[in-house]
Interface confidence: low
């Protein structure tokens, strides 16, 4: 059914990670010839919603007044013009936080670490979870997943960093989640400030696996090494 029309652009305001109960607006922008916009949500009957275009007809608004679990998921949009339906937009993943109680984030042995040494960030949840995410503020690639191998649910994940350099310093938060829906996250943990001392002359560490070929030092907050203790957890770079 997809025609030769260019695909629309899909985005969410104020963003794609929304706290439970907050409002979010999904925008789909097509062309001035658009007559109708359609939003599809994966694993839901299509279309999930239809909207007439807003003047000057090149976009449509889909409103979610109060975010709940039902709205979390993967969306695509299309527009219809006189010559048919467009190709689908790139997917938008709408994530809800606040689905579970907040985990605790701590640094072992200490959040004050000397450059060249090792530190482990420990994310502990109140209930057993099978996915943990570590996020560094203002990082281009902020998400590090630890996901259990066999669906085993546990209370903690360890994010080892070694050797530590100035790149690792900054503010971290973690989330926990159940693998059956990675669109539902816990409340964020309280922030943890990792302070790296004596790092002015440090060379950049080599990551144990490639993170992003285009990323510079500030885009690579985490370079975990070694195995994950309690190993049912598998490391994923996102």
């Amino acid at each position: 059914q997809a025609g030769p029309l260019p695909k629309p652009t899909l985005w969410a305001e104020p963003g794609s990670v929304i706290s439970w109960g907050n409002s979010v607006t999904i925008w789909c922008q097509g062309t001035l010839e658009a007559r109708e916009y359609r939003l599809d949500k994966e694993e839901s009957p299509a279309p999930w919603d239809r909207q007439n275009p807003l003047e000057p007809k090149n976009k449509a608004r889909f409103s979610i007044p109060s975010m709940t679990e039902d709205y979390a998921g993967r969306y695509r949009c299309y527009y219809r013009s006189p010559v048919g339906w467009s190709q689908p937009s790139d997917p938008l993943e709408l994530v809800m936080t606040g689905a579970y109680s907040k985990p605790t984030l701590s640094a072992l042995p200490s959040p004050l670490v000397t450059s060249g040494k090792s530190v482990t960030l420990l994310c502990q949840s109140r209930s057993p979870m099978d996915t943990f995410l570590l996020i560094k503020e203002r990082a281009a690639h902020p998400l590090l997943h630890l996901r259990s191998e066999h669906g085993a649910q546990q209370h903690q994940a360890e994010f080892p960093m070694s050797p530590v350099t100035s790149v690792h310093g900054g503010t971290y938060r973690c989330f926990s989640s159940h693998g059956f829906s990675h669109y539902l996250l816990s409340h964020p943990s309280d922030p943890l400030e990792l302070i790296v001392s004596g790092s002015l002359e440090d060379p950049r560490p080599s990551p144990t696996r490639s993170v992003s070929t285009a990323a510079g030092p500030e885009d690579q907050p985490l370079m975990p090494t070694g195995s994950v203790p309690h190993s049912g957890l598998r490391r994923h770079w996102e």
Epitope: W20, T68, E69, G98, A99, Y100, S101, R126, S127, P128, A152, Q153, Q154, H155, H230
Partner: antibody
Framework: EVQLQQPGPELVKPGASVKISCKAS????????MHWVRQRHGKSLEWIGH????????VYNQRFKNKATLNVDNFSSTAYMELRSLTSEDSAVYYC??????????WGQGTTLTVSS | DIQMTQSPASLSASVGETVTITCRAS??????LAWYQQKQGRSPQLLVY???TLADGVPSRFSGSGSGTQYSLKINSLQPEDFGNYYC?????????FGAGTNLELK
């Protein structure tokens, strides 16, 4: 002081349903999971499931998935467990318990359920 | 599911004695273990969590130990109020499960 208040004994007929309440006080209700635990006469304890009052999310022991439904009323700080299609096998004491993590630091006094015709 | 095997099933002891109750998990539960005391006709009371941390108000004669799959609860210098049933419970993964219990009775 944390308190979990449960009603007295319930006598119900086979095939019926019952809803057991657990009124919490002395702490912020939405901050802790509320668990439910069953104890048959002279037997050990069985974990039924828990609910996170902040948003109603539940986790069930698969053994009780088709037997129990958990919900909460945050305005009254009360948790509820509905048990359906009751048989004599469901006769037991049912406890609500506050979950600090996955251990239970405060328990209700228990509600004795007797299923009999 | 992780199974908890508790032993002994029953135990007779006298006031002033020291007793130990053990619990074995069918898998590694990484110290996510709690111990409860339950007296006849009463609700269980938390004694120990995280395998070795005493709950608020629990006398120091109680102590928990262990790691991996093997855990124990030790009661030094038994007091009259210590007699009753004791249960272990893991909370490492769903579903949480309890041991079958140990009935500690006065000899």
């Amino acid at each position: 002081e944390v308190q979990l208040q449960q009603p007295g004994p319930e006598l119900v007929k086979p095939g019926a349903s019952v809803k057991i309440s657990c009124k919490a006080s002395g702490y912020t209700f939405t901050d802790y999971n509320m668990h439910w635990v069953r104890q048959r006469h002279g037997k050990s304890l069985e974990w039924i499931g828990h609910i996170y009052p902040y948003n109603g999310n539940t986790v069930y022991n698969q053994r009780f998935k088709n037997k129990a439904t958990l919900n909460v009323d945050n305005f009254s700080s009360t948790a509820y467990m509905e048990l359906r299609s009751l048989t004599s096998e469901d006769s037991a004491v049912y406890y609500c318990a506050r979950g600090a993590v996955g251990y239970f630091d405060h328990w209700g006094q228990g509600t004795t359920l007797t299923v009999s015709s | 599911d992780i199974q908890m095997t508790q032993s002994p099933a029953s135990l007779s002891a006298s006031v002033g004695e020291t007793v130990t109750i053990t619990c074995r998990a069918s898998g590694n539960i990484h110290n996510f273990l709690a111990w409860y005391q339950q007296k006849q006709g009463r609700s269980p009371q938390l004694l120990v969590y995280n395998a070795k941390t005493l709950a608020d108000g629990v006398p120091s004669r109680f102590s928990g130990s262990g790691s991996g799959t093997q855990y124990s609860l030790k009661i030094n210098s038994l007091q009259p109020e210590d007699f009753g049933n004791y249960y272990c419970q893991h909370f490492w993964s769903y579903p949480f499960t309890f041991g079958a219990g140990t009935n500690l009775e006065l000899k």
